[in-house]
């Protein structure tokens, strides 16, 4: 088989702005935010995928929802979409019982908790339509949650959700280079609570990393480090029970 | 079509060094990762290490760190693994592999190349 | 290190049957899980990546499951040249993880 692949192949992008697999409604965010042009699919999920994706089939492998992922969780289909009302998730910071996950216990998890700090290999680097996946819960007085994407001695982009800066709840983004931290990229919608499970999963696109977290939007991150595909490690750190870390090619 | 080409054997004494090498064709070889694994009979598979021919930037199984050390000539689309010190433990088949993009994992392997340690 | 268990080194079936082989991780490695199948004198062929993902040009009798710590290679109506050697990955951890291989053998 031929393959004359190269890096700017896999930067061109697939130009689905609302893949399968990655949050299809997001609440009170009007169409077009956050860096989705053209606005996100009407009633894209449930019951229907958006044009080009798999339609009524859960892509292979993915996650919650793909066949023998999670129990309870429904396939096919990858996500069943957020409750009714305002906002795309439920009050409480955790998702109903109806949606992706069953009741019993945090996401509904196969096997134990992982050791943190975590690292998950990227054995053949990060490449576009990644959806990387981390389920877990954060502790109660948590301080701080970290994902470092890690280039050799660099990070790419360091995701650093602060329980406390200054009595504020803040998310810092930024990348490292050469041991010294760039600009900071702040945001303060922060979805996560002490004490709850929570969802973090990050797509990643020719130009940026979005990140979503239980199932809602949150934040997307331009490239500064150019070179995805010399990417090989997700450090992921911080006052969390790590449940589970895996990715998916959507 | 894509190759990984390393030769056939290699018969070397306890304690020399050994170069082998793993000539890749048919990609873009500064795009995926190289990795190399060893295999023994009866000790199955064993990961080593992967390098990134673009960046030179490596990851080592650390049971490997004192005994392998990777590297590429990007000239020639060429892997390499240097193996020290070798003693009989070191007699094994040992893989280049490159792991894939499309497809996460060890799209292709290399024939392999059986190092035999002895005196 | 997390240790990929194939209980089973060695697994009797017939042409036509459906097999199932199974790999046990030690802890939770998601779906970072690879199948490779090595038949004998030759290199490692890719079968499955992601768990479930059937690589370019595998047969559709090669299906692969499970997440977690439980997966399971399966192969409806095996064929002779499948009589042969399979092994699992783990990539959800380094260092990377090989399971010890189980060989399919004729009944």
């Known amino acids: 088989m031929a393959d004359n692949f190269s890096l700017h192949d896999a930067l061109s992008g697939s130009g689905n702005p609302n893949p399968q697999g990655w949050p299809g409604a997001w609440g009170n965010q009007p169409a077009g935010a956050g860096g989705y042009p053209g606005a996100s699919y009407p009633g894209a999920y449930p019951g229907q995928a958006p044009p080009g994706a798999y339609p009524g089939q859960a892509p292979p492998g993915a996650y919650p929802g793909a066949p023998g992922a999670y129990p309870g969780a429904p396939a096919p289909g990858v996500y069943p979409g957020p409750p009714s009302g305002p906002g795309a998730y439920p009050s409480s910071g955790q998702p109903s019982a109806t949606g992706a996950y069953p009741a019993t216990g945090p996401y509904g998890a196969p096997a134990g908790p992982l050791i943190v700090p975590y690292n998950l290999p990227l054995p053949g680097g990060v490449v576009p339509r990644m959806l990387i996946t981390i389920l877990g819960t954060v502790k109660p007085n948590a301080n701080r949650i970290a994902l470092d994407f890690q280039r050799g001695n660099d990070v790419a982009f360091h995701f650093n959700p602060r329980f406390n800066e200054n009595n504020r709840r803040v998310i810092v983004c930024n990348t490292k280079l050469d041991n010294n931290w760039g600009r900071e990229e702040r945001q303060s919608v922060f979805p996560f609570e002490s004490g709850k499970p929570f969802k973090i999963q990050v797509l990643v696109e020719p130009d940026h990393f979005k990140v979503a977290v239980n199932d809602a939007h949150l934040l997307q991150y331009n490239h500064r480090v150019k070179k995805l595909n010399e990417i090989s490690k997700l450090g992921i750190s911080g006052d969390i029970d790590l449940t589970s870390a895996s990715y998916t090619m959507i | 079509q894509v190759q990984l080409q390393q030769p056939g054997a290699e018969l070397v004494k306890p304690g020399a060094s050994v170069k082998l090498s793993c000539k890749a064709s048919g990609y873009t070889f500064t795009s995926y990762w190289m990795h190399w694994v060893k295999q023994r009979p009866g000790q199955g598979l064993e990961w080593i290490g992967m390098i990134h021919p673009n960046s030179g930037s490596t990851d080592y199984n650390e049971k490997f760190k004192n005994k392998a050390t990777l590297n590429v000539d990007k000239s020639s689309s060429t892997a390499y693994i240097q193996l020290s010190s070798l003693t009989s433990e070191d007699s094994a088949v040992y893989y280049c592999t490159r792991w894939g993009i499309y497809y996460y994992a060890r799209d292709y392997w290399g024939q392999g190349t059986t190092l035999t340690v002895s005196s | 290190d997390i240790v990929m268990t194939q209980s089973q080194k060695f697994m009797s079936t017939s042409v036509g049957e459906r097999v199932s082989i199974t790999c046990k991780a030690s802890q939770n490695v998601g779906t970072n899980v690879a199948w490779y199948q090595q038949k004998a004198g030759q290199s490692l062929e890719l079968l499955i990546y992601?768990?479930?993902n059937r690589h370019t040009g595998v047969p559709d009798r090669f299906t692969g499951s499970g997440s977690g710590t439980d997966f399971t290679l399966t192969i409806t109506n095996v064929q002779s040249e499948d009589m042969t050697n399979y092994f699992c990955e783990q990539y959800s951890n380094f260092p990377l993880t090989f399971g010890a291989g189980t060989k399919l053998e004729l009944k």
């Open positions: 992601g768990a479930s």
